[in-house]
Interface confidence: medium
């Protein structure tokens, strides 16, 4: 990938390596700014009918460095009896999401993009699509 | 959460300042390398007894420009027969996301990482926990 | 609904360079990438290179590195493909093509090209 | 590069048929894999996303199916402004790539 040779934006924006040495405000990392209206731990997890657990992935050098990762707990969905039911399936919703990664050994630190596929959430699924009527 | 420790690999980062100039490879975002094994757009969407549509959200200064967030199509969940069950709730699972905002009028281009939520799907809960048996 | 609009045919001689237009409309420049593809008489697609105007990054086809440049004016909304060193195996159909820069169903990149330019003919004859 | 083989090359189909196009990547490309229609003197136009995702305005009777590296598209019901040369798209790696293209005529 190189950069566009004649932007009307940048004009002497420098070609290959410019992707790779890009400022960036990583300001927001370090904010504690309210999450109060965003941050709700929700305990759908356990209340729906395709209910999920969490596990925690862990690594020091990545920003977000904890990321809670859905897996699904049953290959079927729970009915109103807490039944497992055999024409319904429990799948798991993901979501590419974008993580830093710290590059060790290099001063001042750099920062490189990294895209990971988390599981989200579960969601119940039927073999056939139904709409509601 | 703050990436940078007292360390002694690069002793004089400054902390608050030292975040609104970091160099990141941001290589990843433009490749195209294979993603077969995890790249699956699925039709859960529809097939799930919660369903939900996708909306548009655009901002040509964000990276992703396009977000599509999830709303989930009905309040209630839609049963076997294909008619709405008015015991069990159809919610939205939501995750943050880190974006990128191009800031304007700066050359080169310089970036800064926003936290976003977004709707991710919907999945179906009862008002009460349940357990499989 | 986005537009994309081509300039018009080109009849160029072997050895020759060729600069076609493409000109967007109806949507924001920045929020999509375009990839040109092009079409030999009576044969299929094929894919020569995209730019992605966020970040301001070209992609080429090995087949056309070092032949093909594309580029971008965000002022005009418009994207250019040259390619050089014409040869009679150049006379072909080139398209330019909208590839979406979409966060969609959970996924970071979209890159199905979901609109198309009209076409320019380029003729390379001696 | 990936290499998309479709087939048949060439289908004559009577209206109200079912068509069935396939095609073969020479490897693993998860869902990356996009579906056009080509009319004579015409633009390419998008008509599946992502193996099996429809587009807005594109009638329902095409459908899209597969993963992995076999690919189907399927035209249940065909009718005569269907005439048109089908191509597959795979996104997954640089270069993009097409298949050699399926021309469907109507008997």
């Known amino acids: 990938a190189v950069l566009i040779p004649q932007s009307s934006v940048c004009p002497n924006a420098e070609a290959n390596n410019f992707l790779q040495n890009v400022k960036v405000n990583l300001k927001v990392i370090n904010s504690l700014s309210s999450k109060a209206s965003s941050r709700r731990p929700s305990d759908y997890l356990n209340r729906s009918t395709s209910p999920w657990t969490l596990s925690r992935n862990e690594d020091p050098d990545r920003y977000p460095s904890v990321i809670w990762e859905a897996q699904c707990r049953h290959q079927r969905c729970v009915n109103a009896e807490g039944k497992l039911d055999h024409h319904m399936n429990s799948v798991l919703i993901q979501q590419e999401i974008l993580v830093l990664k710290r590059e060790p050994e290099k001063c001042p630190f750099t920062f490189r993009v990294e895209k990971m596929l988390v599981g989200v959430g579960c969601t119940c699924v039927s073999s056939i699509v139904r709409h509601a009527s | 959460a703050v990436l940078i420790p007292q360390s002694s690999v690069c002793p004089n980062a400054e902390a608050n300042n030292f975040l609104q100039n970091v160099k990141v490879n941001l290589k990843v975002i433009n490749s195209l390398s294979s993603k077969a094994s995890s790249r699956r757009p699925s039709d859960y969407l529809n097939r799930s007894t919660s369903p939900w549509t996708l909306s548009r959200n655009e901002d040509p200064d964000r990276y992703p420009s396009v977000i599509w967030e999830a709303q989930c199509r009905h309040q209630r969940c839609v049963n076997a027969e294909g008619k709405l069950d008015h015991h069990m709730n159809s919610v939205l699972i939501q995750q943050e996301i880190l974006v990128l905002k191009r800031e304007p009028e700066k050359c080169p281009f310089t970036f800064r990482v926003e936290k976003m939520l977004v709707g991710v799907g919907c999945t179906c809960v009862s008002s009460i926990v349940r357990h499989a048996s | 609904e986005v537009q994309l609009v081509q300039s018009g045919a080109e009849v160029k001689k072997p050895g020759e360079s060729v600069k076609i237009s493409c000109k967007a409309s109806?949507?924001?420049?920045?929020?999509?990438?375009i990839s040109w593809v092009r079409q030999a008489p009576g044969q299929g697609l094929e894919w020569m290179g995209g730019?992605?105007?966020?970040?301001?990054?070209?992609d080429y086809a090995q087949k056309f590195q070092g032949r093909v440049t594309i580029t971008a004016d965000e002022s005009t909304t418009t994207a250019y493909m040259e390619l050089s060193g014409l040869t009679s195996d150049d006379t072909a159909v080139y398209y330019c093509?909208?590839?979406?820069?979409?966060?969609?169903?959970?996924?970071?990149?979209?890159?199905?090209?979901?609109?198309w330019g009209q076409g320019t003919t380029v003729t390379v004859s001696s | 590069e990936i290499v998309l083989t479709q087939s048949p090359d060439f289908q004559s189909v009577t209206p109200k048929e079912k068509v069935t196009i396939t095609c073969r990547a020479s490897?693993?490309?998860?869902?990356?894999l996009h579906w056009y229609q080509q009319k004579p003197d015409q633009s390419p136009k998008l008509l599946i996303k992502?193996?099996?995702h429809s587009i807005s305005g594109v009638p329902s009777r095409f459908s899209g199916s597969g993963s992995g590296t076999d690919f189907t598209l399927t035209i249940n019901g065909l009718e005569a402004e269907d005439a048109a040369t089908y191509y597959c798209?795979?996104?997954?790696?640089?270069?993009?790539?097409f298949g050699q293209g399926t021309k469907v005529d109507i008997k």
């Open positions: 490897q693993n490309i998860g869902s990356e």
């Open positions: 093509a909208r590839e979406p820069n979409d966060f969609w169903n959970g996924y970071y990149d979209t890159h199905d090209f979901d609109s």
């Open positions: 109806g949507g924001s420049f920045r929020s999509y990438g």
């Open positions: 992502y193996a099996s």
């Open positions: 798209h795979q996104s997954d790696t640089l270069p993009h790539t």
């Open positions: 730019i992605t105007h966020f970040f301001g990054i070209t």
